[in-house]
């Protein structure tokens, strides 16, 4: 906030390889945006879309990658009358290497190879209990050996020292296709570690993202208090205890006999405390004899504790 | 001199368990994808499974997939194979195989050969 | 059933050249790297030629190897005695996650 009046921006000479989707969001009112300097090899579709107000646009690269990616360029910049400042010449593929992506027929922007990775097997989203081993996998293919390399973000944040382990099988058709893994190990988990991780695969023509898997950390349900056996005469009021932790907060369920339609129940004798640990029943009758069960579950699992109710008549 | 030694091996009864080990020297252990490759008597070789450098990639045959279990302990240079359920077709000749890495800038490029054989060990299973 | 297919026996008299086939599909020899070992009854196998045609240090050149397609070949000159062995291709089937698989083998003799 505070930039969306920004009339004018200069970026040139900053090692600009890549355009994002929403790399110049929050600058709706750009009128002269300047990337020159810049081996631009790519820029996502509709990049520039929201800068209605964009006049002048300035690009000097001759590393672009003239994949299917790019189509949507040279008809964008035509039809926003941006073409004059652009000078945009292929690199790659071969068969395209130093034409203007404005002389290239459209037909002839394909992805025949992939030499910016591809994703192929992607994170998933995990549950793991504190104090376990997780890991994160993550493949791409590419059809380029031009050096790779892997990186993993925690919450959008590159992960600087992050455990991981990288390796590659190749396949061999018609010319090599490399399959990438990058697997991340996250070792004795904490709270500390609950996030959304997403890995990030690059090499000379552009970095691909995963998409974002979160882990949730778990803790089983432990009691805090259990009930115990009581004995009480009928009429009064009986007394129960039960409260446990965990992660997620367990919810504290009671059964009778293993049941949950029983009569303290039905007959709204039954009384549990909200913010309490104790579960009452009042007017206590020959029938609410058994054996109580307190039930803790949350999402890691559910642990049980048993009291037995005896009921003596007055 | 760049070695494996498998062991582990016997005699068990079908649906029982049995645990091989596979311990490495004379290379960097770490650097290299592991295998299980078996033979049953009279029979070819059988691919089994296999484990990435670290560890975090396993692969399985189908015959064995939900039964086998392969794992490693890098401070201790060793590859294991748990083998639950046994049947008797999982009779055989039991070999780990170093699969040949190249390790370049923590990257490892897995190629198609196994180079390192151990000597293999018998697993027998029958009643 | 085997995935690739090799003849059970071949057989040459020593000094001769033999080939020995291995035949698959496009989702293995088609898609991926093959390689061969050579079991001499009794021993563990033994790496003979990977990626295709790279022969392992200490492999001798009467080995080499190529492939077309979805077939590939073994090439022995030159044959010795202790030549005489079982021979296996091997490849990945599909990707990496579904795993290797090996040829059902072909036993040389030398006569």
């Known amino acids: 906030s505070g930039l969306d009046s920004l009339s004018k921006l200069t970026l040139f000479g900053n090692k600009i390889k890549s355009v994002a989707k929403r790399a110049f969001s929050g600058l709706e009112g750009l009128e002269h945006l300047n990337l020159g300097g810049n081996a631009i090899r790519s820029v996502q579709f509709d990049a520039f879309v929201k800068m209605k107000n964009l006049k002048e646009l300035h690009i000097s690269s001759d590393s672009f990658l003239c994949d299917c990616q790019l189509k949507w360029l040279p008809p964008w910049l035509i039809g926003r009358m941006l073409q004059a400042f652009v000078t945009a010449t292929c690199a790659h593929p071969e068969s395209l290497k130093g034409q203007s992506i404005f002389s290239v027929p459209p037909e002839s922007f394909v992805c025949d190879d992939f030499l910016k990775p591809q994703i192929i097997t992607q994170p998933e989203t995990t549950m793991a209990m504190v104090g376990k081993d997780i890991r994160f996998t993550c493949s791409a293919a590419s059809s380029s050996s031009s050096p790779m390399t892997f990186a993993w973000k925690k919450d959008n944040e590159v992960l600087t020292n992050a455990d991981m382990e990288n390796f590659v099988h190749v396949h061999a058709q018609d010319g090599e296709v490399m399959e990438y893994t990058t697997i991340l190990h996250l070792r004795q988990v904490t709270f500390g570690h609950e996030g959304r991780y997403q890995c990030v695969i690059t090499n000379h023509f552009g970095s691909t993202y995963s998409h974002k898997a979160r882990l949730t950390v778990n803790v089983l349900p432990s009691f805090t208090k259990t009930p115990h056996d009581i004995t009480i005469r009928t009429t009064t009021m009986a007394r129960l205890e039960c409260a446990a932790t965990g992660h997620p907060n367990p919810q504290i369920a009671w059964q009778k006999d293993g049941g949950t339609d029983f009569p303290a129940a039905r007959e709204r004798r039954m009384h549990v405390m909200p913010d309490d640990d104790v579960f009452f029943i009042t007017d206590v009758k020959i029938d609410d004899a058994g054996v109580y069960s307190c039930t803790a579950q949350n999402s890691a699992g559910s642990i049980s504790a048993n009291a037995t109710l005896t009921v003596l008549e007055t | 001199e760049v070695q494996l030694l498998e062991s582990g091996g016997g005699l068990v009864q079908p649906g029982g368990s049995l645990r091989l080990s596979c311990a490495a020297s004379g290379f960097t252990f770490s650097n290299y994808a592991m295998s299980w490759v078996r033979q049953a008597p009279g029979k070819g070789l059988e691919w089994v499974s296999v484990i990435s450098h670290g560890g975090g990639s396993t692969y399985y045959a189908d015959s064995v997939k939900g039964r086998f279990t392969i794992s490693r302990d890098n401070s201790k240079n060793t590859l294991y194979l748990q083998m639950n359920s046994l049947r008797a077709e999982d009779t055989a000749v039991y070999y780990c195989a170093r699969v040949i890495s190249n390790c370049h800038l923590g990257v490892c490029y897995y190629s198609n050969g196994m180079d390192v054989w151990g000597q293999g060990t018998l697993v027998t299973v029958s009643s | 059933q085997l995935v690739l297919t090799q003849p059970p026996s071949v057989s040459a008299a020593p000094g001769q050249r033999v080939s020995i086939s291995c035949s698959g599909s496009s989702s293995n020899i088609g898609d991926n790297y093959v390689s061969w070992y050579q079991q001499v009854p009794g021993s563990a196998p033994k790496l003979l030629i990977y990626d295709n045609n790279k022969r392992p240090s200490g492999i001798p050149d009467r080995f080499s190897a190529s492939k077309s397609g979805t077939s590939a070949t073994l090439g022995i000159t030159g044959l010795q005695t202790g030549d005489e062995a079982d021979y296996y291709c091997?490849?990945?089937?599909?990707?990496?996650?579904?795993?290797?698989?090996f040829g059902g083998g072909t036993k040389l003799t030398v006569l």
């Open positions: 091997a490849t990945w089937d599909g990707s990496l996650s579904a795993g290797r698989v």
